[in-house]
Every structure is written in C-alpha cells, then in structure tokens.
Amino acid sequence: AIELVPEHQTVPVSIGVPATLRCSMKGEAIGNYYINWYRKTQGNTMTFIYREKDIYGPGFKDNFQGDIDIAKNLAVLKILAPSERDEGSYYCACDT
C-alpha cells in the first residue's frame, strides 16, 4: 500500500522565516504520481494549495512553492514568508 508520511507532525515556524514541509512516500516511487498539497484551517475547510507542476490555488502562488525530490522520494512544500494566516494543518496527497 502507498503511504504519504509527514516528516514532522508539528512544524514550528517564525514569521517571515522560510519554512519547509516534507512528506515521504512509502511503498512506491513518488515519481509515478502527481503531488498535491492542501491546507485545513479552523472550521475544517480544506483549501487547495498546489498541484504539480505549476498549478496553485488562488492566492498561494506568491508565497508557496511546491517541489519534489525524486531521489529521496519526498514531496516538498516551501512557505516563503510565513505569517499568522498560514497556520493550519497541511496535507500532501497524490494521484495519477
């Protein structure tokens, strides 16, 4: 079975300091899938952030950067200049 595992359950972030979220794929090669990222905020609203290669949800392109590391089987999401409004639970997902 394929599993996407977050590198850290909690990521402390300083305002304005770039932060990186990572998800590791277990059981399969990440290269075979399209990687997606979502954010869940208070009220359980799930918001689309990014889909490979260059598709971003409204308002996310300027401050977020999606990436993959095929050699390490990682999905990566960079928050370039975090602010309080970026707080929430981030989810990586994959599809074909």
Partner: antibody, heavy 121, light 107 residues
Framework: QVTLKESGPTLVKPTQTLTLTCTFS??????????VGWIRQPPGKALEWLAL???????IYSPSLKSRLTITKDTSKNQVVLTMTNMDPVDTAAYFC?????????????WGQGTMVTVSS | EIVMTQSPSFLSASVGDRVTFTCRAS??????LAWYQQKPGRAPNLLIY???TLQSGVPSRFSGSGSGTEFTLTISSLLPEDFATYYC????????TFSQGTRLEIK
C-alpha cells in the same frame, strides 16, 4: 528494450507538406504518464521542441509552429506521425522523436537516431 | 515562452578537469530542469532530470544542482568521451524549451 525510429522524406520542396513517422517498440502509448515528442535541430544549431502527444490523446504544440503542425498516434501500430505544412528552407533540420515520461517529469529519456530533412527546390 | 540561457557557449578543458555549465531560466521553473549530452551526428542523451536526479546508467561524475532560475551541471573529472555539446531544458511550461547549448572542447 525501448527504441524509436524516425522515417520520412529526406528532401521536400518549399510549400509542400512534410510527413514524418516515429515507429517505436518496448513501451506502449496507452500507459499512463507516457508520451512521444518531436524535436528538431537545424545544422549546427540548438534543439527546438516541436510537439508532444500523450497517452490520453492530449496534444501540445510549440506556439510558433502550432498553425503548421499536427501530431497523431496509432497505438495499434506503435506509431506517432507529425505533419508540418508549408515547408520552407529554414525548416531544414534533423528531426528527432523521443519518449516523454511523467516519472521523469517529462524529460525525454529515449531518443530516435533522427532523420535529416532538407527543404529545397 | 520561457527562454533558457546557457553559458558559456564554448568551453575548453582537459581530461581530468572539473567543469561546470550554467543554465538560467527567464522565469522561475522550480526544479523542473533536465540536462542532455549530444555528440556530433547523434541524438541527445538524458543525463539529469528534476535538476539533480541522475538518469539510470549515467556515471556519477555528472551532477546537477539549482532551483528557481539558476542551475548548474558539473562533471567532476573529465573523460575523453565527455567532450560533446550539453543542453538544458525547462520542463515546467509548454513549450519545453531548450538552451542554445555549450560545446565542450579539448584544450
């Protein structure tokens, strides 16, 4: 073993239509994430990306040549055909077909040997 | 379309040298970049994809790095068979444009 081979005329007259065929083996164009692209290279010059057809029949063309190009596939024959209308001497080039793979994020991992096409009256 | 600029256009080096090619994109392409080697009269050969992932069968003396708009391909110790032309290609936005290439010559 994956192979691709281009075939078509070596000499085309100006204003004529060029038809090139890429015959491949060792993979299927019905497999998710696979495509076949065409690239050309004028003598002594750089590579130019022309067109791509994907496993799901999606086609993409270079904007500068879009009005002149058509790419199609015949999965039963393992062939991809590129047609280019209104040929001009500046279209003289080696034409390559190559396999595109999503797992390599669309890099061309296997190329044909290329076929040289000269446009002259 | 995205313009890929490679420097230098020509590079002279000797067997055993360490050489670096630079490729710049006219806009950010994350790490969606490939490097190819082409020898005269031959088709290009894929060396690296996603900026730094070595293609299967490519010797480890080849390495790639970079993100955004600036990328490098390094050959750690040149062998005679490495003298060829090298191209980068962006893979984020159609058309997937190539650079003009760098010809690596024997000094």
């Amino acid at each position: 073993q994956v192979t691709l081979k281009e075939s078509g005329p070596t000499l085309v007259k100006p204003t004529q239509t060029l038809t090139l065929t890429c015959t491949f083996s060792g993979f299927s164009l019905t497999t998710s994430g696979v495509g076949v692209g065409w690239i050309r290279q004028p003598p002594g010059k750089a590579l130019e990306w022309l067109a791509l057809i994907l496993w799901n029949d999606h086609t993409i063309y270079s904007p500068s040549l879009k009005s002149r190009l058509t790419i199609t596939k015949d999965t039963s024959k393992n062939q991809v055909v590129l047609t280019m209308t209104n040929m001009d001497p500046v279209d003289t080039a080696a034409y390559f077909c190559a396999r595109d793979k999503w797992e390599l994020r669309d890099a061309f991992d296997i190329w044909g040997q290329g076929t040289m096409v000269t446009v002259s009256s | 379309e995205i313009v890929m600029t490679q420097s230098p256009s020509f590079l002279s080096a000797s067997v055993g040298d360490r050489v670096t090619f630079t490729c710049r994109a006219s806009q950010g392409i994350s790490r969606y970049l490939a490097w190819y080697q082409q020898k005269p009269g031959r088709a290009p050969n894929l060396l690296i994809y996603v900026a730094s992932t070595l293609q299967s069968g490519v010797p480890s003396r080849f390495s790639g790095s970079g993100s955004g708009t600036e990328f490098t391909l390094t050959i750690s110790s040149l062998l005679p068979e490495d003298f060829a032309t090298y191209y980068c290609q962006q893979l984020i936005s159609y058309p997937y444009t190539f650079s003009q290439g760098t010809r690596l010559e024997i000094k």
